[in-house]
Amino acid sequence: MEADKDDTQQILKEHSPDEFIKDEQNKGLIDEITKKNIQLKKEIQKLETELQEATKEFQIKEDIPETKMKFLSVETPENDSQLSNISCSFQVSSKVPYEIQKGQALITFEKEEVAQNVVSMSKHHVQIKDVNLEVTAKPVPLNSGVRFQVYVEVSKMKINVTEIPDTLREDQMRDKLELSFSKSRNGGGEVDRVDYDRQSGSAVITFVEIGVADKILKKKEYPLYINQTCHRVTVSPYTEIHLKKYQIFSGTSKRTVLLTGMEGIQMDEEIVEDLINIHFQRAKNGGGEVDVVKCSLGQPHIAYFEE
């Protein structure tokens, strides 16, 4: 290899000394670029690690309440491919929880400008029975909330099979599943492929024709015979779920104000809520039309904010 290098240099020298100098300069430049490249790669790796950590921080688990769906219309598919899947998407916005501590209250006004005015005045003297109480109005510091689209595709060609017994070798079980699900007497049909996972005892079966999956799914179970023993495997629709347009939002509520400074009050929360309501209804107190008041004098309460 060294001899090769010498040969190359010799050829270059024969051409012209200038060309050789240029080549040496180029070599220096290439070395510099290589070093910079390595440096950038390290930087990318560092940033990717940071990104992964940041992603973990923003992972959330939300209990989304059940929603009643309204069926609007039937669409006539333009082609067969539209029949092979049923698609639907849902817009999900999480409610942002806020814990009202003891001695605090939340007041929501009808108009944003009233809330802003109450906050800018900061100190307010509220008459609670025979006590003139000084409360402080602040913006509500909300945690971040999320908004995303759930895109669901229900296949009309595939089914999920679970509770498959671990009684056969993998290839034999794959064949057995294909054979069983191709039997027309059981509602089956020609199988295109079987993706079997022995560890989880589950499989995804893809049929050649549309309609076979529907027929099988009319029942929750399907008979799978192995050495004269009937095992009842569970069949369910094959769905693919994608999260789209995932957004994290944070901010302060424009119409709701946090009131603090009521720690010493020993009264019924509802009475205090009424008195706060009356006080802040009045324009001379910097208030306006009130939507709702929630007060916490004993146990902390959770209030939920939504867009």
Epitope: D171, Q172, E178, L179, S182, V191, Y225, I226, N227, Q228
Partner: antibody, heavy 124, light 112 residues
Framework: QSLEESGGDLVKPGASLTLTCTAS?????????MCWVRQAPGKGLEWIAC????????TYYASWAKGRFTISKTSSTTVTLQMTSLTAADTATYFC?????????????????WGPGTLVTVSS | ALVMTQTPSSVSAAVGGTVTINCQAS??????LAWYQQKPGQPPKLLIY???NLESGVPSRFKGSGSGTEYTLTISDLECDDAATYYC??????????????FGGGTEVVVK
């Protein structure tokens, strides 16, 4: 419905040979295994190998046939058996047979369709 | 490995008589047993599958029975045409081994 074997020949020890089985009147489906069975002159039937006719194309061999014999599905109506390092002991009539699933559950099987056989003679 | 042991290797009986052929599997084959008839120069012909189910077109004189590891083929009202070699065969699926097929050694039936 019928099966026909071809490729049988007189070969020298150590040679290789490929047999072909062609199906007529039906094409392979999930309800079948396509198999090869041989019979030495004046002897009994000996199972060699099977291939699942469904999508997986899983293959199964008799322990003595592993490594030297290869079964393949070359189309929806043909199956081949490749044989290597042949010896005089491999001299036999080679049958192609369809192993059929008889019940709704794939638990009862039977070779319900056979080819007439093709003769393989290994001799120097 | 699955081994099928067939007895006797040869049996003879008169026309109208009955013959019984036995087949023993080396392990439980769950009644997945078939019986075949083979005549010289011909491929085997399936008679019975699932130990006792008659293949279509096969006379009811052929009767299969058994379970577990022990199986029997009974041919009654013997006819000259029944002279042939009979084989038992099974295919076994299991958790610990490949799917396996095996034939018995065969029983030659001679009709006098």
């Amino acid at each position: 419905q019928s099966l026909e074997e071809s490729g049988g020949d007189l070969v020298k020890p150590g040679a290789s040979l490929t047999l072909t089985c062609t199906a007529s009147g039906f094409s392979f489906s999930s309800s079948y295994y396509m198999c090869w069975v041989r019979q030495a002159p004046g002897k009994g039937l000996e199972w060699i190998a099977c291939i699942y006719a469904g999508s997986s194309g899983s293959t199964y061999y008799a322990s003595w046939a592993k490594g030297r014999f290869t079964i393949s599905k070359t189309s929806s109506t043909t199956v081949t058996l490749q044989m290597t390092s042949l010896t005089a002991a491999d001299t036999a009539t080679y049958f192609c047979a369809r192993e059929y699933s008889y019940d709704d559950y794939g638990d009862f099987w039977g070779f319900n369709l056979w080819g007439p056989g093709t003769l393989v003679t290994v001799s120097s | 490995a699955l081994v099928m042991t067939q007895t006797p290797s040869s049996v003879s009986a008169a026309v109208g008589g009955t013959v019984t052929i036995n087949c023993q599997a080396s392990q439980n084959i769950y009644t997945n047993l078939a019986w075949y008839q083979q005549k010289p120069g011909q491929p085997p012909k399936l008679l019975i599958y699932g130990a006792s189910n008659l293949e279509s077109g096969v006379p009811s004189r052929f009767k299969g029975s058994g379970s577990g590891t022990e199986y029997t083929l009974t041919i009654s009202d013997l006819e000259c045409d029944d002279a042939a070699t009979y084989y038992c065969q099974s295919s076994l699926e299991s958790r610990i081994a490949d799917r396996a097929n095996a034939f018995g050694g065969g029983t030659e039936v001679v009709v006098k």
